[in-house]
């Protein structure tokens, strides 16, 4: 089924309204903000989650050097336009008719313009680098144990196919998780790396999106892994287009 039948809730998305009004009285859940039906057996798209969030009441070195084309989400929250499949529309505009182009994870990849701005296609983010710093521990984590635990987390909690977790790097106290997923690699039903990264980011911040599930208790050989800083870099299949002014 798409949602928990007994009490009609969405296990993978608490930002939903559910009722037994689906076919045959089945539980059907709709995302807050957009009212779109969601599949509760998998992760909800980041676009619908952001929309729901905006509608909710306000309350040698082994580490990777991000490419010069890597994007960081500096713009923060906005109320996005999502397509009928729940993906970000390539062009996003605010209420004051300021528009910009985004990638598949909803991060701005061009300078801001007006309503005449054209965004020909939704450019796919194919490489995500999650950069974490953990709190002090009694000693460094064993790299292979850490690697195994993070891969297990993405496989079991976020249902991301293991082949999309490209690497886990560790140089105390920094952990880097590389997610890679080209358009050609992503099959129907595969969780998108952007959605998995967003769920992970919210878990790390103690803002789990899962219904009724406890917060993320990440442990490596019994020892708690507590993250105190997160940075996420996004690399697109086509490099972003910013003016030189922004780069100086």
């Amino acid at each position: 089924h798409t949602a928990a039948q007994d009490n009609c809730t969405c296990p993978t998305n608490k930002m939903t309204v559910c009722s037994p009004d689906g076919p045959g009285g089945r539980c059907q859940c709709r995302a807050l903000g957009s009212g779109m039906a969601v599949d509760c057996s998998t992760l909800t798209s980041k676009c619908l989650l952001l929309k729901a969030r905006m509608s909710a009441p306000k309350n040698a070195r082994t580490l990777v050097r991000p490419s010069e084309h890597a994007l960081v989400d500096n713009d923060g929250l906005y109320d996005p336009d999502c397509d009928p499949e729940g993906r970000f529309k390539a062009r996003q505009c605010n209420q004051t008719s300021v528009c910009w182009c985004v990638n598949s994870v909803g991060v701005r990849r061009t300078d801001k313009g007006d309503l005449s701005l054209r965004c020909d296609e939704l450019v796919r983010t194919h490489h995500i680098l999650i950069d974490l710093r953990h709190r002090p521990t009694a000693g460094a984590f064993n790299h292979s144990d850490l690697d195994a635990e993070l891969r297990r987390l993405f496989r079991e909690r976020y249902r991301l196919h293991p082949k999309f977790v490209a690497a886990v790097h560790y140089e105390q106290p920094t952990i880097q998780i590389e997610l890679r997923q080209n358009t050609s690699q992503k099959a129907a039903g595969d969780v998108d790396i952007g959605d998995a990264a967003y769920y992970f980011e919210r878990d790390i911040k103690g803002e789990s999106l899962f219904q009724g599930r406890g917060g993320l208790d990440l442990r490596v050989r019994g020892e708690p892994l507590q993250v105190e800083r997160t940075l996420i870099y996004y690399l697109d299949e086509i490099p972003p287009k910013f003016s030189m002014k922004r780069l100086t």
Epitope: R133, R135, P136, T137, A138, G139, Q172, P173, D217, R219, R221, G222, E223, P224, Q226, E228
Partner: antibody, heavy 123, light 109 residues
């Protein structure tokens, strides 16, 4: 509300052994590091020992080699065993809870304290 | 072994702002960690006013705050009250063991 109740203090003999127990309630015991801090009469606070939620341990220099800290998640207790007691172990022993699970940065993370149990080592 | 440095005493009139500094904590890859503990009388249980540099337990008034600049942490009491008179200990991280400062006596005049 978080409560930490210590027991096991009292008059002890030099060279003997001491076992202090702290029972925690009002929080998910298994998720947090726990520890012991002591204060000798007229002196300041001194770190004794700590144990993470994953049971890694740390000890202060004055008790290293003589102390063992352990936890029982089922009973929500943390125990401090201190052997080969000396007069300088005379102090009020406080049970302390960390705001986190890890133990290494323990002292800066204490968010709750017990009322303390007095230990006097004297012949 | 590391040693934490904090002033032995500070004094203030009611309503004034008091700052108590603590330095000398352990460096964990460029980050320093401190906590502040209030003890109103010797032998009475300490009370945490700030932990993990800036976090304040829910039962502590908002006039208590903590801030870090470099390797020094500052406990600030804005609008000090007579009830705040106590000894304030700072605590920090030192690899596998914890350390405390010698304590600062706050006198409210």
């Amino acid at each position: 509300a978080v409560t930490l109740d210590e027991s096991g203090g009292g008059l002890q003999t030099p060279g003997g052994a001491l076992s202090l127990v702290c029972k925690g309630s009002g929080f998910t015991f298994s998720s947090y590091a726990m520890g012991w801090v002591r204060q000798a009469p007229g002196k300041g606070l001194e770190y004794v020992a700590a144990i993470s939620s994953g049971s890694s341990t740390g000890y202060g220099a004055a008790v290293k080699g003589r102390a063992t800290i352990s936890r029982d998640t089922g009973q929500s207790t943390v125990r401090l065993q201190l052997n080969n007691l000396r007069a300088e172990d005379t102090a009020t022993y406080y049970c302390a809870k960390s705001g986190y699970g890890g133990s290494a940065s323990y002292v800066s993370d204490i968010d709750a304290w017990g009322h303390g149990t007095e230990v006097i080592v004297s012949s | 072994a590391l040693a934490l440095t904090q002033p032995s005493s500070v004094s203030a009139n009611p309503g004034e702002t008091v700052e108590i500094t603590c330095s000398g904590g352990g460096d964990y890859y460029g980050t320093y960690y401190y906590g502040w503990y209030q003890q109103k009388a010797p032998g009475s249980a300490p009370v945490t006013v700030i932990y993990d540099n800036t976090k304040r337990p829910s039962n502590i008034p908002s006039r208590f705050s903590g801030s870090t600049s470099g390797s020094t942490n500052t406990l600030t009491i804005t609008g000090v009250q007579a009830d705040d008179e106590a000894v304030y200990y700072c605590g920090s991280y030192d690899s596998s063991a914890g350390i405390f400062g010698a304590g600062t006596t706050l006198t409210v005049l």
